[in-house]
């Protein structure tokens, strides 16, 4: 039950995170005009990854797309790439994790396969979250550098006199959305990886016990899936007993086509 909850929660958290990453990527407010100490200009500028916008004081807003690819800063291109990779990985991860959910039965899919898929989606979510966090952080670093450069430029010149009134940009809402969303996706991925460990039946350390049935003496070997095999093809480690003493939790957690309880 705990495994199902962990997996389900990981899926939901990742879903919210990826939705946030998509939202952040599409948002126009990655950088916004710094309005500290009263607005300097009568227009409010803000920029996204795909277009820049200007809001007139009347409320009229005009946005212009960056209709060039080569003319854009390399850093911006890198941020775009990181966010897109994050979205793609997250989307694939979501698709995989839907089929991996314990509460959804698809044909006679083994738990080993579900565990495999859960781990795969978990890793994808982690990488997706890291891509988003990296993308947002690169952009934030770019803003901080430009902010202090423009601040320095404002006070250089003859006798420290203000020579130019520069429009400085600060963190926009999209950055915070991106950081939170990336974090959620990362957490969701970790939860999926934790759930995967629970989905995979681990090898028990019971000593071999001989049960003497009437008529024949049959040895029952302890077995189970070896955790170390990484949930691959399970030819060597099939259970070779038809029944045996096991806990109720084991019965619930690891049913497979070889178990007839």
């Amino acid at each position: 039950m705990a495994v199902t909850a962990c997996q389900g929660l990981g899926f939901v958290v990742s879903l919210i995170g990826i939705a946030g990453i998509i939202a952040a990527t599409c948002m126009d407010q990655w950088s916004t005009q710094d309005l500290y100490n009263n607005p300097v200009t009568a227009v409010f500028n803000y920029q996204g990854l795909w277009r820049s916008c200007v809001r007139e004081s009347s409320g009229f807003t005009e946005c212009r797309g960056y209709f060039t690819l080569l003319g854009l800063p390399a850093m911006l291109q890198a941020v775009r790439a990181l966010m897109i990779v994050g979205i793609v990985l997250g989307a694939i991860g979501l698709l995989v994790s839907i089929f991996a959910l314990k509460c959804i039965r698809i044909g006679s899919m083994e738990d080993s396969a579900k565990a495999n898929m859960t781990l795969t989606s978990g890793i994808m979510f982690i990488v997706s979250g890291l891509c988003a966090i990296a993308g947002v952080s690169v952009f934030a670093n770019m803003l901080v550098t430009n902010f202090w450069m423009s601040t320095a430029n404002m006070y250089t010149g003859m006798g420290g006199m203000v020579q130019t009134v520069q429009t400085r940009y600060t963190f926009g809402a999209a950055l915070f959305v991106g950081w939170v969303a990336g974090g959620l996706t990362l957490i969701g991925g970790v939860m999926m990886c934790i759930a995967c460990r629970g989905l995979a039946p681990e090898e028990t350390n019971y000593k071999a016990v001989s049960y003497h049935a009437s008529g024949h003496s049959v040895a029952y070997k302890p077995g189970g899936f070896k955790a170390s095999t990484g949930f691959g093809s399970n030819t060597k480690n099939k259970k070779i007993y038809d029944g045996g003493a096991r806990t109720e939790d084991e019965v619930q957690s690891y049913p497979s086509k070889h178990d007839y309880v």
Epitope: N38, P39, V40, T41, A42, V43, N45, Y46, Q47, S52, C53, V54, E56, S57, S58, G59, F60, E62, R64, T164, V165, T167
Partner: antibody, heavy 119, light 113 residues
């Protein structure tokens, strides 16, 4: 059509205050900024400040802070500018002007109020 | 504050002539976000309030005759009247409507011979 009605003249004594009105009609009063501009006799134009009638948000020219106070009465679609501690230097024509929607320019102007400060 | 410098003043011309007046700002009025220059031109006829002619440096206000043309970018702007008419007798002001406080030039007085 857009109209901004201002009283023609205001005669005030030095040290006193005056409240110049600007009645707007022909448009949605709360949508556009209302600007105030002064022009001394034979001189150029000087921006005093602006007020947004919807929420009374305002921006002032630092030079006129303390001298001019901008207010609005949404119920009567009227903008006001109060001028305090008047001196003969404040004798001028005061215009109200409606801000444009697409740009920050002043699309429509009132006829102006001539404020004369004299003992 | 942004200083707007207008020249020449006064400007005496004969009707039908082409007139060019200039306006320089102490700082660029170009907003990189939308590539627009926040400079406005007003016409003030004697005894009247100013009238909006051109905004965004080159966009003519509706109802303004097409003989009025605004041009320029950054810090240098011009207002051109292609064929001056007697009714164009006025003072022309340029205005910075980008930086606070909004500032006007001293004006160019157009006189007709």
């Amino acid at each position: 059509q857009v109209q901004l009605q201002q009283p023609g003249t205001e005669l005030v004594k030095p040290g006193a205050s005056v409240k110049v009105s600007c009645k707007a009609s022909g448009y949605t009063f709360t949508t556009y900024w209302m600007h105030w501009v002064t022009q001394r006799p034979g001189q150029g134009l000087e921006w005093i400040g602006r007020i947004r009638p919807s929420d009374s948000d305002s921006n002032y020219n630092q030079k006129f802070k303390g001298k001019a106070t901008l207010t609005v009465d949404k119920s009567s679609d009227t903008a006001y500018m109060q001028l305090n501690s008047l001196t003969s230097e404040d004798s001028a024509v005061y215009y109200c002007a409606m801000g444009a929607y697409f740009s920050n320019s002043f699309a429509y102007w009132g006829q102006g109020t001539l404020v004369t400060v004299s003992a | 504050d942004i200083v707007m410098t207008q020249s020449p003043s006064p400007l005496t011309v004969t009707a039908g002539e082409k007139v060019t007046m200039t306006c320089k700002s102490s700082q660029t009025l170009l907003n990189r976000g939308n590539q627009k220059n926040y400079l406005t031109w007003y016409q003030q006829k004697p005894g009247q309030p100013p009238k909006l002619l051109i905004y965004w440096a080159s966009t003519r206000e509706s109802g303004v005759p097409d003989r009025f043309t605004g041009s320029g970018s950054g810090t240098d702007f011009t207002l051109t009247i292609n064929s001056v008419q007697a009714e164009d007798l006025a003072v022309y002001y340029c205005q910075n409507d980008y930086f606070f406080p909004f500032t006007f030039g001293s004006g160019t007085k157009l006189e007709i011979r």
